[in-house]
Amino acid sequence: AIVFIKQPSSQDALQGRRALLRCEVEAPGLVHVYWLLDGAPVQDTERRFTQGSSLSFAAVDRLQDSGTFQCVARDDVTGEEARSANASFNIKWIEAGPVVLKHPASEAEIQPQTQVTLRCHIDGHPRPTYQWFRDGTPLSDGQSNNTVSSKERNLTLRPAGPEHSGLYSCCAHNAFGQACSSQNFTLSIADESFARVVLAPQDVIVARNEEAMFHCQFSAQPPPNLQWLFEDETPITNRSRPPHLRRATVFANGSLLLTQVRPRNAGVYRCIGQGQRGPPVILEATLHLAEIEDMPLFEPRVFTAGSEERVTCLPPKGLPEPSVWWEHAGVRLPTHGRVYQKGHELVLASIAESDAGVYTCHAANLAGQRRQDVNITVATVPTWLKKPQDSQLEEGKPGYLHCLTQATPKPTVVWYRNQMLISEDSRFEVFKNGTLRINNVEVYDGTWYRCVSSTPAGSIEAQARVQVLEKLKFTPPPQPQQCMEFDKEATVPCSATGREKPTIKWERADGSSLPEWVTDNAGTLHFARVTRDDAGNYTCIASNGPQGQIRAHVQLTVAVFITFKVEPERTTVYQGHTALLQCEAQGDPKPLIQWKGKDRILDPTKLGPRMHIFQNGSLVIHDVAPEDSGRYTCIAGNSCNIKHTEAPLYVVDKPVPEESEGPGSPPPYKMIQT
């Protein structure tokens, strides 16, 4: 019990436009719907596909969609099947075609006074209505002795005469639309007294000093006149020739011969035929002087064995177009084989090492010959001459790792350190032969190095481990002058490294032993409580078996570190008054005082008349101005240490006393009053 709610219906359709055949089904069970075209299942395509149960056409095609469509619904469980009514398209279309000669059989047979029939090959459905045109003007039935049938597609001219000559085209229309002829027909029916071309001159290319011949013939009844002209419209005859055409000869049959052609002879030659009636017939031909330019240079080429490569030879500009061929070792290449020429290309299929060498591209025409060489190298995979080897390099000295290879072309060598590409800098240098030089070897240069040698054919690589032989050195070297604070605990470190762990000891420079309150603990000199007598010169000695010993001299100074006795205070001063910023420091050696005002050091030699720094370190500023406001820093320093302290200076306007304020009332700020 499959029921169709909608059946497809036959309908008009337009070629190339959308269409839809509807089908809607109801059934007790699940059904699948498919379509038949003339009894065969319809396969979905982008153009024609099922949409739900309906069949959709994106673009109707008069060839593929002609026939009877049927919608089929099938219940796969019960096997029940129902088929819709048949539906088909009445497809409307129109298709352009050429205008062709139907009668006589060929153009050569068209003679004056014969019947000529043209056929318009525009087809369509419904059958189109035709309209004929001569030189773009519509023709109507019975017009000027021609019979036109618009029902049929034929145009009959009876009889055909010169007045019928022209370009014939046709258009047709039907319910689909309009189309015009894709190719038109030129009908030429000559008047016997008109000059007609028998032989037309052709363009000629000649080499300098060669000869050129132009042929030209016309026929007419009575016979026509023939005349030759050169570019400047100067007539060429055997009696009167222009100066630059002294070597021109016009023959009785109309041919023009030019001997010993020069560049000034190049140009357009016109052959003019004039009949008793009708317009003159002008034929043109050009005389070109042969020429050939130079060929561009080839870059040398590097190819790999086994590959297929092509080298294109760009022919030089020339007239006529130069012919191109390739040669190798003086022998022209064949057009097939393993190494051959194809068009302008040199083809090397499955390259062998023996293919290396110079190949020459030749180009030639009437003007001469040109050639250009290309050097072809067949790359080989590098081979080892000397691989890098595990090496022991001395710290601080230059070290070398070798990577010597050979190949064609010369290989390029790159080095990697810990898988990182080494870029040449002040410490690394790669020589032309591939050797790596490490300038001033450092401890951390001890790692893996890999060199890669490459050509276009392939690469080889090898790696080596570098072990750095450390020199005996202090790490870090002790400071040559150091201060210790009097009556405090102090330490002076000394450490060193070498190939073997060095032993470290301290001694006084004069050789005397260290006092009992000074200990040497694994290279660290320890003063439990610094005395004045601890000042002096000390030597740190680092030594090991293989490398001997090294010494570092240290001068120790005992100092009382700086403290401030008086520090500057936050100060507010009336404009025009004097500001005093006090600063006093003590220490041993006796500290020097410097002042910094508004982020610059105040140089005592360049202070000017308003500022002065006293021996005790205090800073006085006379006649203060608002721009003197800011932070002032007192810096106390000696050879052992440096300390600083700072305070702000504010410069304010003196207030005008108000009536409400009693005499002697205090100012609103903590002031320095001078």
């Epitope: 019990a1 499959i2 029921v3 169709f4 709610i5 909608k6 059946q7 219906s9 309908q11 509807r22 089904v25 109801e26 059934a27 007790p28 069970g29 699940l30 059904v31 219940d75 129902a82 819709s84 009514a85």
Partner: antibody, heavy 122, light 107 residues
């Protein structure tokens, strides 16, 4: 003989509910879509909605005027279609017909019930 | 929704006259159009399906034509039993819609 018999009509207040039944016999009910059509007194025919067959997953479609208030269902084992009407309005007053149509083979069929009157009034 | 415009809404003709009713769809409905006859107090009865096909048992005096948007229903010779209201109905697209009806009476 094909028969469609509607029942369940009557008087109901606005906002009330009513369920109409349509009992089918004499044709393969399970393979047909069922439609409901109504006709107010002295007025034209108005399509109410449709329920499709199992082949089309019992899909339902409704007229805009009843969407959200009316529900069509069916029971193929009882050869019966239903129209559940909720939130009834006075303008729902009409004779309600159930109907079925389509091609069986190449013959078109168009079956209508005798109709049942629904009056919505306070 | 597809609007169906039926004309005339009523017409009076003599027995034996040829009667024509037209129906216009607001968009192309192909040939998915039915014509119904409804007599007072009765359910509608199908006369023409798919625009031009006569239903089984319907006299040949009824006919339909048209495709796309314009459709015509014709009674070739009016008889007294033809007094009724006639409706066109499209089922190309849901919702199914009816014309407003044409009431036919005899002069």
């Amino acid at each position: 003989e094909v028969q469609l018999v509607e029942s369940g009509g009557g008087l109901v207040q606005p906002g009330g509910s009513l369920k109409l039944s349509c009992a089918a016999s004499g044709f393969t009910f399970s393979g047909c879509a069922m439609h409901w059509v109504r006709q107010a007194s002295g007025k034209g025919l108005e399509w109410v909605g449709r329920i499709r067959s199992k082949a089309n997953n019992y899909a339902t479609t409704y007229a805009a005027s009843v969407k959200g208030r009316f529900t069509i269902s069916r029971d193929d084992s009882k050869n019966t279609a239903y129209l559940q009407m909720n939130s009834l309005k006075t303008e729902d007053t009409a004779v309600y017909y159930c109907t079925s149509r389509g091609y069986s083979g190449f013959d078109w069929f168009d079956y209508w019930g005798q109709g049942t009157l629904v009056s919505v009034s306070s | 929704d597809i609007q169906m415009t039926q004309s005339p809404s009523s017409l009076s003709a003599s027995v034996g006259d040829r009667v024509t009713i037209t129906c216009r769809a607001s968009q192309d409905i192909s040939n998915y159009l039915n014509w119904y006859q409804q007599k007072p107090g009765k359910a509608p009865k199908l006369l023409i399906y798919d625009a031009s096909n006569l239903d089984k048992g319907v006299p040949s005096g009824f006919s339909g034509s048209g495709s796309g948007t314009d459709f015509t229903f014709t009674i070739s010779s009016l008889q007294p039993e033809h007094i009724a209201t006639y409706y066109c109905q499209q089922y190309d697209n849901l919702p199914i819609t009816f014309g407003q009806g044409t009431r036919l009476e005899i002069k």
